[in-house]
């Protein structure tokens, strides 16, 4: 029978569950631990101080807890301050907490003392340098000054001048005596150990303002923009370059060591990039505002002034045109130009046009034309309507015929075509 069915093995409200191995296991409620939830959880009471994280475990039937302390705290319940927090150990020494709760520093070689701040004088402790080498104490270490013929950190090796080679920058070492050597330097280097890059710039051939830049056994010329080539002796054809050396439609002409631009009207400057200020020479009249344009200018006139230079009195100010007419000023002489609305004529648009007497009768179908101020009216004959008597009146629209008769529209009248058995004007 499944173990969970033989009376629950779990105490204190634990829930029995069957494992894949068919064994019973207890899921304990908060506050209880142990195989059968029979032990009180020591973490339930919150024994870890501050932000310490409590972890409970059962060892030999006894429930225990341990605290994982946050930085700066230690002890079984994280209540003790950590003495290592202030980094008391110098020179990279490792800090730990001693049994008395104080810090302990494990000093690296060359340092000593409680905080590893004291330098060990290795030259006093025995004689580390061999073959009569002179010991020099250094912070955290020591150095040996070897006598002629010896080398190595402790002067322990007999010296071989070319092993390792002291020659730099690819120089070749040649032993010239027991303890002496010569360096055969590569071209462009000099000095006892080929450590000096020879300055190749004295006597350089950079022309036309080119600047010499030293290299290894060579030099390069940094040319000004107008010149190019190894020694800045080649003229740059600026007119071949992109973008164009001359802006705004200017024409480029190469010159030896430069170029020149012939600018189109309205532009100036070395590369035709400056718009000429035409307002500098403009004569807009007093009170007008000058606006520069490309190769021209525009005068914005104050109220009452007109003309290209605002030098004319604006005749439109006095409203010389009849109402509804549009007034414009002649920019040459300042006179008013009235644009008349339909139906009016004359210099000031104040004369009525008699539409009835100019040309053909504007009224169709013999309508009578009556002139009005600014327009005309058409008095239409019988059977016609519309502004110009252009529309034939459909007398059938009112449905005058009765008894399903058919209505025929005629000019100014109608005719009813009666159904069988009916008669009369309206088939009534």
């Amino acid at each position: 029978a499944p173990p969970c069915l033989d009376g629950s093995p779990c105490a204190n409200g634990g829930r029995c569950t069957q494992l894949p191995s068919r064994e019973a296991a207890c899921l304990c409620p908060p506050g209880w631990v142990g195989e059968r939830c029979q032990l009180e959880d020591p973490c339930h009471s919150g024994p870890c101080a501050g932000r310490g994280v409590c972890q409970s475990s059962v060892v030999a039937g006894t429930a225990r807890f341990s605290c994982r302390c946050p930085r700066g705290f230690r002890g079984p319940d994280c209540s003790l301050p950590d003495p290592c927090l202030s980094s008391p150990c110098a020179h990279g020494a490792r800090c730990s907490v001693g049994p008395d709760g104080r810090f302990l520093c494990s000093c690296p070689p060359g340092y000593q003392g409680r905080s590893c701040r004291s330098d060990v004088d290795e030259c006093r402790v025995g004689e580390p340098c061999r073959h009569g080498g002179t010991c020099l104490n250094t912070p955290g270490s020591f150095r040996c000054q070897c006598p002629a013929g010896y080398t190595g950190p402790l002067c322990e090796n007999p010296a071989v001048p070319c092993a390792p080679s002291p020659c730099r920058n690819g120089g070749t070492c040649r032993q010239s005596g027991d303890l002496t050597y010569d360096c055969a330097c590569l071209p462009g280097f000099e000095g006892q150990n080929c450590e000096v890059n020879v300055d190749d710039c004295p006597g350089h051939r950079c022309l036309n303002g080119g600047t010499c830049v030293d290299g290894v056994n060579t030099y390069n010329c940094q040319c000004p923009p107008e010149w190019t080539g190894q020694f800045c002796t080649e003229d740059v054809d600026e007119c071949q370059l992109q973008p164009n050396a001359c802006h705004n439609g200017g024409t480029c002409f190469n010159t030896l060591g430069g170029h020149s631009c012939v600018c189109v009207n309205g532009w100036t400057g070395e590369s035709c990039s400056q718009n000429i200020d035409d307002c500098a020479t403009a004569v807009c009249f007093h009170g007008a505002t000058c606006h520069d344009r490309v190769a021209s200018f525009y005068c914005a006139c104050p109220m009452g002034k007109t003309g290209l230079l605002c030098h004319l009195d604006d005749a439109c100010v006095s409203n010389p045109c009849h109402e509804d007419a549009i007034c414009d000023t002649n920019p040459v002489n300042g006179r008013a130009i009235c644009t008349c609305p339909p139906g009016f004529t004359g210099g000031a648009c104040d004369q009525d046009v008699d539409e009835c007497s100019i040309g053909a009768n504007p009224c169709e179908h013999l309508g009578r034309c009556v002139n009005t101020q600014g327009s005309f009216l058409c008095q239409c004959g019988r059977g016609y309507t519309g502004p110009r008597c252009e529309t034939d009146v459909n007398e059938c629209l009112s449905g005058p015929c009765r008894n399903q008769a058919t209505c025929l529209d005629r000019i100014g009248q109608f005719t009813c075509i009666c159904m069988a058995g009916f008669t009369g004007t309206y088939c009534e």
């Epitope: 080539g229 054809d237 010159t255 030896l256 060591g257 020149s260």
Partner: antibody, heavy 120, light 112 residues
Amino acid sequence: EVQLLESGGGLVQPGGSLRLSCAASGFTFSNYDMSWVRQAPGKGLEWVSYISRGGGSTYYPDSVKGRFTISRDNSKNTLYLQMNSLRAEDTAVYYCGRHATTAYWYFDVWGQGTMVTVSS
Amino acid sequence: DVVMTQTPLSLSVTPGQPASISCRSSQSLVHTQGNTYLHWYLQKPGQSPQLLIYKVSNRFSGVPDRFSGSGSGTDFTLKISRVEAEDVGVYFCSQSTHVPWTFGQGTKVEIK
């Protein structure tokens, strides 16, 4: 006909000065860069100065730099070469030359030359 | 300065026969922007120089097609396919890639 006509040559003492002229005709002078080239007796050709079409750019080789000055008057269609501190080695026939195009710098028209003799 | 060396310095040719003049420069005449500015001039006896060939191989207007130019870098050649009596004079090569512009020392061509 396109023509360049040099004048102003002659005999001058070492340390003296001379001004050569080159009159242009048959073409729009102000559209062309110009140069002076000299030829010592029985010798090769040597370029001695350059000036751009508008006169704003000039160039001299080291042999004459600081002693010779090239200039032009486009209104008179004339090129000039002012020669100061003359030396015996400046003795030569001096030609003015027109540059066909400012991209290639070859001479498409030459004058007939004017002789300069520097001697004491 | 770029030195232009011409060979031979003098040349005696039978009319109708070909002739060839060599010109060598002390530096490459290929301009950084691509072109090669090597030109040939002829100075007839008692006259000023006249342009024959510009930019290595381009015949100047009015120059007979018996004249041709070739070459690249530092080595250039002027060829006359069939020499005529009017071709006598001193031929100069010239470079305008580098300033100062320089000329060769000249090659004197005469008729046998």
